[in-house]
Interface confidence: low
C-alpha cells in the first residue's frame, strides 16, 4: 500500500542504496519514489547536523521487510517512497528555495529580473536540471540578478550551501511545462551517436523511451532489437546525451530503433511505468517471491502490490501449473530493468505498475453563492484537481468550481444545482487554466449522476455538498489529477497553509475571471467564525477561512471549488467553497463545507458495485 507519513526527528539506520543532496525532504522523497530500489528515505536538513558534508543529505534506503530501525536524530526527517501512491507520483517539483545555493555544473549565465524568470529559462533549456538566482540584494554587486543554469551527473546538486540572497530551484520540465516541445517520432533502423549515460535491457523501444524520459541525463536513445546481429547487445537500450542536446550524427543500422526523451513535451508526459505485457518473453532478475495465481493479469497485480517487485514472469510450463493457477515469478534488479530477456518461451512478462499514476489507488497520505478576491493568477498544473462546472443553455457560462476526487467523481457544493438539477445542461471542464481556452472543440465531461446530500435544503447553508459521477472516467495527467481527501474526523487545527482557488468574481460586483485565481487564506476557528455570523449557525460540519481585515476571499463563481491545505508535503481537500457575507469583507470569513465531516457519506456514495471506493480516500 501507499505510506505517506513522515517521521520527524527520526533517521532510518542501514539499508542504504544511494545518497545525494536535496533541498528538502519532499524532493528527497520524490527521488526515492523514482529510484528502482528505494523504499525508505532519511533527510538531514542544514539545521540537523554540524557536519557540513552531510547537510542536505538525502539517503535512499531499501529493506526486505519494508522497515528499518529508526534512531532519534533531532531535525532529521524520514519517510517512505510514494511507489504505489497513484496520482501522488510525480517528478514535478515547483518549490523555490530561498537562502540556498544548489551547486552543479554552471553552463549558462544570464541577467534576469526575477527567480520565476530564471526557473522559466531553466525549464526552456534542454540541458538545465536546476538553477540558482542571485537576488538584487546579493552581497557582490556584479552577481546580482544572475541566473545560473546547471546540471549534474545525477540530476541533483553536487552540493547545497546556505547562502543569503540566493534562490534555487529545479527545472519544471517534469511538470510538462517546457516550451521546447518534443519529438514523438521513433526512428526505425537508425542508431544515434554521442555519449552513453546508461545502459539497460528493455523489451521494446517504448519502454526504452520512457526510461530515457525519466533519466536525469538522457536526451535521446538507441534501442537494439531482439534480432540485432550481436547476441550480447540484443534488447539493449542505450540512454544518450550530447553537448548540443541533439545527436551529432545518426547511422542507418538494421534492427536498431532510436528516439528522443519526452521530458520536453508540453502538457503531457508519459507515465513513469510500463503497463504492456509481453507474451512469449521471460524477464530474468533476482527472485523476490514465487506465487501461484490465475492468469498473467493477476500476476502483474501481485507484482504491483508487492512494493519491492519491479517485474515478473508468468510461467505456463506444465510443471509450473496446477489446476488453473501457474507460477508467477516476482523479480527485481539493481536498476529496475530485467537482467536477461529471453524470447520464444512459455511465459509472459511485464512490469510492476507501482509507479503508474492512473491507478485507482485508494490511499493518500499519502484529506449565499460565493470567487477569489485579492488573489493571483495560477499556473499550469498548480491545482490539477480544479474543475469548472459550466451550464449550456442558449449560451454557455461558468457557474461553479469543483474538485476531482477520483477518475469518475467530482465533489462540489449542493447549492450549485439550485434551480439547475438537469444533468444534461452541465459540462465539466478539467485540466484547464484559462476559461478563454475553451472552444467548441475542447473536450468536456458530462454528468451521469448528481448526488446532492440528503439533508441539504435550498437557501440554507447546511450540508452544502454534492457528488457528481461523470459519464466516463478521466485519465490522470500532470494537469488533471485528484485531490486527497482528509481523514475522517480530521481537526482543522493541523492545517496552516491553505488556499482557495476558482474563476469567480474578483470583487463583490465583478465578473468571472479568465485565469484560475488562487489565494492563501488562514483558517479561522468555528468560535471566531460564529462571532462574525451571529444570525447564522456555524456548525461543526463547516470550516471558516479569512483575514480579519478582509481583502482576500472566495466570491461568486467559486462555489463548489476547493479549499485545500498542504500538510506534511501533501495537499488535502479541507473545504468546499459554500457561502459568506459578501466577498472579502472585514471580519466576515468565508464559510466552507468541512469535507472531513462528510467522509462516511462520500465513501458510501462512491462505492462501486464491487465495493471498492472509486476516489482518493484517506489512509
Amino acid at each position: 500500500g501507499c505510506l505517506t507519513q513522515l517521521y520527524e526527528n527520526a533517521f532510518f539506520r542501514g539499508g542504504d542504496v544511494a545518497s545525494m543532496y536535496t533541498p528538502n525532504a519532499q524532493y528527497c522523497q520524490m527521488r526515492c519514489t523514482f529510484h528502482p530500489r528505494c523504499l525508505l528515505f532519511s533527510f538531514l536538513p542544514a539545521s540537523s547536523i554540524n557536519d557540513m558534508e552531510k547537510r542536505f543529505g538525502c539517503f535512499l534506503k531499501d529493506s526486505v521487510t519494508g522497515t528499518l530501525p529508526k534512531v532519534h536524530r533531532t531535525g532529521a526527517v524520514s519517510g517512505h517512497s510514494l511507489k504505489q501512491c497513484g496520482h501522488q507520483i510525480s517528478a514535478c517539483h515547483r518549490d523555490i528555495y530561498k537562502g540556498v545555493d544548489m551547486r552543479g555544473v554552471n553552463f549558462n549565465v544570464s541577467k534576469v529580473s526575477s527567480v520565476e524568470e530564471c526557473q522559466k529559462r531553466c525549464t526552456s533549456n534542454i540541458r538545465c536540471q536546476f538553477f540558482s538566482y542571485a537576488t538584487q540584494t546579493f552581497h557582490k554587486a556584479e552577481y546580482r540578478n544572475n541566473c545560473l543554469l546547471k546540471y549534474s551527473p545525477g540530476g541533483t546538486p553536487t552540493a547545497i550551501k546556505v547562502l543569503s540572497n540566493v534562490e534555487s530551484g529545479f527545472s519544471l520540465k517534469p511538470c510538462a511545462l517546457s516550451e521546447i516541445g518534443c519529438h514523438m517520432n521513433i526512428f526505425q533502423h537508425l542508431a544515434f551517436s554521442d555519449v552513453d549515460v546508461a545502459r539497460v535491457l528493455t523489451p521494446d523501444a517504448f519502454v526504452c523511451r520512457t526510461i530515457c524520459t525519466y533519466h536525469p541525463n538522457c536526451l535521446f536513445f538507441t534501442f537494439y532489437t531482439n534480432v540485432w546481429k550481436i547476441e550480447s547487445q540484443r534488447n539493449v537500450c542505450l540512454l544518450k546525451t550530447s553537448e548540443s542536446g541533439t545527436p551529432s550524427s545518426s547511422t542507418p543500422q538494421e534492427n536498431t530503433i532510436s528516439g528522443y526523451s519526452l521530458l520536453t513535451c508540453k502538457r503531457t508526459l508519459p507515465e513513469p511505468c510500463h503497463s504492456k505485457i509481453y507474451p512469449g518473453v521471460d524477464f530474468g532478475g533476482e527472485e523476490l517471491n514465487v506465487t501461484f495465481v490465475k492468469g498473467v493479469n493477476v500476476c502483474q497485480e501481485t507484482c504491483t502490490k508487492m512494493i519491492r517487485c519491479q517485474f515478473f514472469t508468468y510461467s505456463l510450463l506444465p510443471e509450473d501449473c496446477k489446476e488453473e493457477k501457474c507460477k508467477c515469478f516476482l523479480r527485481l534488479s539493481m536498476d529496475g530493468s530485467p537482467t536477461r530477456i529471453a524470447y520464444g518461451t512459455q511465459g509472459s512478462s511485464g512490469y510492476s505498475l507501482r509507479l503508474c499514476n492512473t491507478g485507482d489507488n485508494s490511499v493518500c497520505t499519502t484529506k449565499t453563492s460565493t470567487r477569489i478576491v485579492g488573489g493571483t493568477n495560477s499556473s499550469w498544473g498548480e491545482w490539477p484537481w480544479q474543475v469548472s462546472l459550466q451550464v449550456k443553455l442558449t449560451a454557455q457560462r461558468h457557474l461553479c468550481g469543483g474538485s476531482l476526487i477520483g477518475h469518475q467523481w467530482v465533489l462540489t457544493a449542493a447549492h450549485c444545482f439550485d434551480g439547475l438539477p438537469l444533468q444534461d445542461v452541465w459540462r465539466i471542464y478539467s485540466g484547464i487554466l484559462n476559461l478563454s481556452d475553451i472552444t467548441k472543440d475542447t473536450p468536456f465531461s458530462q454528468i451521469k449522476e448528481i448526488i446532492i446530500h440528503q439533508n441539504y435544503k435550498v437557501s440554507e447553508g447546511n450540508h452544502d455538498i454534492a457528488l457528481i459521477k461523470l459519464q466516463a472516467p478521466l485519465n490522470y495527467t500532470e494537469f488533471q489529477k485528484p485531490i486527497c481527501l482528509p481523514s475522517k474526523g480530521d481537526t482543522s487545527t493541523i492545517y496552516t497553509n491553505c488556499w482557495v482557488t476558482g474563476w469567480g468574481f474578483s470583487k463583490e460586483k465583478g465578473e468571472i475571471q479568465n485565469i484560475l485565481q488562487k489565494v492563501n487564506i488562514p483558517l479561522v476557528t468555528n468560535e471566531e467564525c460564529q462571532k462574525r455570523y451571529q444570525d447564522y449557525k456555524i456548525t461543526q460540519r463547516m470550516v471558516c477561512a479569512g483575514y480579519k481585515e478582509g481583502g482576500k476571499d472566495a466570491c461568486k463563481g467559486d462555489s463548489g471549488g476547493p479549499l485545500v491545505c498542504k500538510h506534511n508535503g501533501m495537499w488535502r481537500l479541507v473545504g468546499i467553497t459554500s457561502w459568506g457575507e459578501g466577498c472579502a469583507r472585514r471580519e466576515q470569513p468565508g464559510v466552507y463545507t468541512k469535507v472531513a465531516e462528510y467522509m462516511d457519506w462520500i465513501l458510501e456514495k462512491t462505492q462501486s458495485s464491487d465495493g471498492k471506493a472509486q476516489m482518493q480516500s484517506p489512509a
Epitope: 500500500g1 539499508g15 526486505v64 521487510t65 519494508g66 528499518l68 523476490l288 517471491n289 502490490k305 508487492m306
Partner: antibody, heavy 117, light 107 residues
Framework: QVQLQQSGAELMRPGASVKVSCKAL????????MHWVKQTPVLGLEWIGA????????AYNQKFKGKAIFTADKSSRTAYMYLSSLTSEDSAVYYC??????????WGQGTLVTVSA | DIQMTQSPSSVSASVGDRVTITCKAS??????LAWYQQKPGQAPRLLIS???GLEAGVPSRFSGSGSGTDFTLTISSLQPEDVATYYC?????????FGQGTKVEIK
C-alpha cells in the same frame, strides 16, 4: 531452498546467559534481515527484534532492550541472539525467522530455553 | 504498541464446516496483516499476507479479508490437517505484534 537451522535446547540457571544461533542456508545471508520471535504459553508470540547481517543494523522491541543482543557472522552465515540475566520469565521457545517480501515466510525449528534453579 | 485482538480463542467445528477467525487491531494497520498457522511442535507457517494474498502452496480454502482495523481469516471447508493454532500479525509499525492465537479443533 531456504533453511534456518537453530541450535539445540538449553537448560540454564537463573542469572546466567545463553546464546542461541541460527544458521542460514539457501539464500544470500547478507541480503535479508533476520528476526527473532519468542513464544510462551501465556503471552504467545512476541517479536523481539531483527538484525540486518549486511549492514549490521539492529532493531529491538523496547520490551527486550537490555535482555537480547543480536549479532551476525557473515563468514559462517549465522545469526546469534544473546540473552542475559535469565529469569524464569525467559523460559520460552525462541525462533529465528526471515521475511520474504514483508511477513515471516521462513522460520527456524525453534530453540527451547528453560530457566530453572 | 499496536494491540492485536483475536477471537474466538478456540473453535471446534466439523470437517467441511466454514470457520471464521477475526483479528482486530487497536489502530489502522493499512492492510499490513499476515496470518500464520502453527501445528503442535512446529514453527508457525505463513498462510496469507496483505501484499500478495495466499502464499504459494497454501490451499485455496484459506482466504483473508478486511481492512483498516478489522480482519478475517476464513477456512471455507475445514479439513483434518487444518487442526492448528492460527495467529494474526501486524507489520505496519514496530514493534510488530501478534494476536494471542485461535485454536482450531475438529469436533
Amino acid at each position: 531452498q531456504v533453511q534456518l537451522q537453530q541450535s539445540g535446547a538449553e537448560l540454564m540457571r537463573p542469572g546466567a546467559s545463553v546464546k542461541v544461533s541460527c544458521k542460514a542456508l539457501g539464500y544470500t545471508f547478507t541480503d535479508y534481515e533476520m528476526h527473532w520471535v519468542k513464544q510462551t504459553p501465556v503471552l504467545g508470540l512476541e517479536w523481539i527484534g531483527a538484525i540486518h547481517p549486511g549492514s549490521g543494523g539492529t532493531a529491538y522491541n523496547q520490551k527486550f532492550k537490555g535482555k537480547a543482543i543480536f549479532t551476525a557472522d557473515k563468514s559462517s552465515r549465522t545469526a546469534y541472539m544473546y540473552l542475559s540475566s535469565l529469569t524464569s520469565e525467559d523460559s520460552a521457545v525462541y525462533y529465528c525467522t526471515r521475511p520474504y517480501g514483508y511477513p515471516f515466510a521462513y522460520w527456524g525449528q525453534g530453540t527451547l530455553v528453560t530457566v530453572s534453579a | 504498541d499496536i494491540q492485536m485482538t483475536q477471537s474466538p480463542s478456540s473453535v471446534s467445528a466439523s470437517v467441511g464446516d466454514r470457520v471464521t477467525i477475526t483479528c482486530k487491531a487497536s489502530e489502522d494497520i493499512y492492510n499490513r496483516l499476515a496470518w500464520y498457522q502453527q501445528k503442535p511442535g512446529q514453527a508457525p507457517r505463513l498462510l496469507i499476507s496483505g501484499e500478495t494474498g495466499l502464499e504459494a502452496g497454501v490451499p485455496s480454502r484459506f482466504s483473508g479479508s478486511g481492512s483498516g482495523t478489522d480482519f478475517t481469516l476464513t477456512i471455507s471447508s475445514l479439513q483434518p490437517e487444518d487442526v492448528a493454532t492460527y495467529y494474526c500479525q501486524q507489520y505496519w509499525s514496530t514493534p510488530w505484534t501478534f494476536g494471542q492465537g485461535t485454536k482450531v479443533e475438529i469436533k
